[in-house]
């Protein structure tokens, strides 16, 4: 079941999925000046069986100026630097995503893809939040959100994360509420879809959150 909405927006924070549940779809979008190749896929789809999941279809972009060609232009160094990638840096990868059954790992970038990736999540998907550069978590419970089905409608749980500018918190050096334990979560926010592996991702990620940042933009 597709989630009807996007994950909640937290001021000065971004979110990221560590792995994508089967059924997730990703728009095949190209950066300005490029378009999908003729008869190219509109979406990638995370699909698989009990032992292996992978992305069906492949996104391919070609220059808008050229007709009937699949020539793919390699970005110049400054273009590559500017690109906001959805790949997280290796120190940030909490666990091997392939170890999550029924999930796909982050699709590798395709040439000349758009700077922003638009995912269409399914029920049971978990995303993780962190403060953007220049902001820190003042106090925080679980910094994740799960898409849940309730009374036939989908909704995202509310992440317990507040991001504040570093100047505002300088009077409280090093002060930060400890991460709430799963037992401390309100019943309404507890999801039967959270697996041990999912929680392991969340806790390991929390440990590395303050020192690194991912730059994906989401709508």
């Amino acid at each position: 079941e597709l989630c009807d909405d996007d994950p909640p927006e937290i001021p000065h924070a971004t979110f990221k999925a560590m792995a994508y549940k089967e059924g997730t779809m990703l728009n095949c979008e190209c950066k300005r000046g490029f378009r999908r190749i003729k008869s190219g896929s509109l979406y990638m789809l995370c699909t698989g069986n009990s032992s292996h999941s992978s992305w069906d279809n492949q996104c391919q972009c070609t220059s808008s100026a050229t007709r009937n060609t699949t020539k793919q232009v390699t970005p110049q160094p400054e273009e590559q630097k500017e690109r906001k990638t959805t790949e997280m840096q290796s120190p940030m990868q909490p666990v091997d995503q392939a170890s999550l059954p029924g999930h796909c790992r982050e699709p590798p970038p395709w040439e000349n893809e758009a700077t922003e990736r638009i995912y269409h999540f399914v029920v049971g998907q978990m995303v993780y939040y962190q403060c953007v550069q220049g902001y820190r978590a003042l106090h925080r419970g679980p910094a994740e959100s799960v898409c849940k089905m309730t009374h036939g409608k989908t909704r995202w749980t509310q992440p317990q994360l507040i991001c504040t500018g570093e100047m505002e918190t300088s009077q409280f050096p090093g002060e930060e509420k400890p991460q709430a334990s799963p037992e401390g979560r309100p019943e309404s926010e507890t999801s039967c879809l959270v697996t041990t592996t999912d929680f392991q991702i969340q806790t390991e990620m929390a440990a590395t959150m303050e020192t690194s940042i991912f730059t994906t933009e989401y709508q």
């Epitope: 597709l2 996007d6 638009i118």
Partner: nanobody
């Protein structure tokens, strides 16, 4: 899920025009790449036109210059304006978003 409902099909003479509409619900419309497909009797479903989130259109060669795809994000609707219709345009026209399809609307071009 995404629900898609097409309308606007009908019988038209060669050279005539029709405007198809597809109303979408159930998912943030502005995040969707929208497409129109068509299927003629005994033939495979073929892509007619797509429109990006920013409104950029793409057309099949067979309809380029005659058909125009557009979207209204405020109304959660995508349109297909079909001009200079030909008998070979006769088909059931389907709206598509993600893996979801409308029920189709019949377009018949005949004198």
């Amino acid at each position: 899920e995404v629900q898609l409902v097409e309308s606007g099909g009908g019988l038209v003479q060669p050279g005539g025009s029709l405007r198809l509409s597809c109303a979408a619900s159930g998912r943030s419309f502005s995040t969707l790449i929208m497409a129109w497909y068509r299927q003629a009797p005994g033939k495979q479903r073929e892509l007619v036109a797509t429109i990006e989130r920013d409104g950029t259109p793409t057309y099949a060669d067979s309809v380029k210059g005659r058909f125009t795809i557009s979207r209204d994000n405020a109304k959660n609707t995508v349109y297909l304006q079909m001009n200079s219709l030909r008998p070979e345009d006769t088909a059931v026209y389907y709206c598509n978003a993600l893996r979801f399809w409308g029920q189709g609307t019949q377009v018949t071009v005949s004198s």
